[in-house]
Interface confidence: medium
Amino acid sequence: VPIRQLHYRLRDEQQKSLVLSDPYELKALHLNGQNINQQVIFSMSFVQGEPSNDKIPVALGLKGKNLYLSCVMKDGTPTLQLESVDPKQYPKKKMEKRFVFNKIEVKSKVEFESAEFPNWYISTSQAEHKPVFLGNNSGQDIIDFTMESVSS
């Protein structure tokens, strides 16, 4: 059964864009006019999870690529990764838990909490050119993003 997908660009609250730096890593950096098209477009799928007034379960794929953000435990720490999937099977309504994020809207911003690891969020660093990672909202890490809709 086809599932609903919408396409977005994400920027953190410092207006850093997200780019694919090697096959399996996202980085956050400021882009200027001529290289603005380097930023990735996310395919957001509405998937199995527990929706509520303020949380919507979604999966985040990279448009045009068989890659999804997923959350796994590595060396005892919840970790964000880009995972390659079978394009014949994904996206699907019932994604494995590691692919599910609770999209939380806070005023005009949005946060993405791991469903597998509550209170861990897709995060960026204050510094430029650093990997996007899974953080527990501590210190100076950025967890608030803006979403720019992209026509399909």
Epitope: Q48, P51, K92, K93, K97
Partner: antibody
Framework: QVQLQQWGAGLLKPSETLSLTCAVY????????WSWIRQPPGKGLEWIGE???????NYNPSLKSRVTISVDTSRNQFSLSLSSVTAADTAVYYC?????????????WGQGTLVTVSS | QSVLTQPPSVSVSPGQTASITCSGD??????AFWYQQKPGQSPVLVIY???KRPSGIPERFSGSNSGNTATLTISGTQALDEADYYC?????????FGGGTKLTVL
């Protein structure tokens, strides 16, 4: 309160086609998935398949070649057709709703219809 | 086809804790659900998304799911909890029920 009411022929001969319909009363039809499940006498539950309001379907691979699930959104109804039945298809057949608020699982069920296949 | 395995029967004394397991390959990667079915009745959802209770389901019902095993736990089991219990999950594009466990309250 949501209610699912189902009906259809209860006695079939081998090789005939089973046909059941489920009507949905209360609640939106388009916001959910609609499923069929069966349970042979004294045995466990078996998921048959599902459909959404647009007519997109998923089927159990073991039954896929014989099953058709269809939808009539104007009547808030969906139907099951199972061809070339044998005695092994004797079961109570349930219709059910899969809801996003319960993680896309089956939260409301019909009353069940016993279908017997016998020559 | 994917398989979810449950013990055929579990017995418990009133007031005690009953645990019903459901095992399947990498089941913890997916969400597990549990249904209660009493004789002659349609199944009723008692646990969804591993560990959440629908409204109207008593607090004594709880669930967990990790590794290859999902577990339904009924604490302070009552006579009215005697029923068949089915776990339920999905396998790629289709849904799978466990074989069912008959819970007997002695």
């Amino acid at each position: 309160q949501v209610q699912l009411q189902q009906w259809g022929a209860g006695l079939l001969k081998p090789s005939e086609t089973l046909s059941l319909t489920c009507a949905v009363y209360g609640g939106s039809f388009s916001d959910y998935y609609w499923s069929w499940i069966r349970q042979p006498p004294g045995k466990g539950l078996e998921w048959i398949g599902e459909i959404d309001h647009s007519g997109s379907t998923n089927y159990n691979p073991s039954l896929k070649s014989r099953v058709t699930i269809s939808v009539d959104t104007s009547r808030n109804q969906f139907s099951l057709s199972l061809s070339s039945v044998t005695a092994a298809d004797t079961a109570v057949y349930y219709c059910a709703r899969a809801s996003p608020s319960s993680g896309w699982t089956l939260d409301y069920w019909g009353q069940g219809t016993l279908v017997t296949v016998s020559s | 086809q994917s398989v979810l395995t449950q013990p055929p029967s579990v017995s418990v004394s009133p007031g005690q804790t009953a645990s019903i397991t459901c095992s399947g390959d990498k089941l913890g990667d997916k969400f597990a659900f549990w249904y209660q079915q009493k004789p002659g009745q349609s199944p009723v959802l008692v646990i969804y998304l591993d560990n959440k209770r629908p409204s109207g389901i008593p607090e004594r019902f709880s669930g967990s799911n990790s590794g290859n095993t999902a577990t339904l736990t009924i604490s302070g089991t009552q006579a009215l909890d005697e029923a068949d219990y089915y776990c339920y999950a999905w396998a790629d594009t289709y849904e799978v029920f466990g074989g069912g466990t008959k819970l007997t309250v002695l």
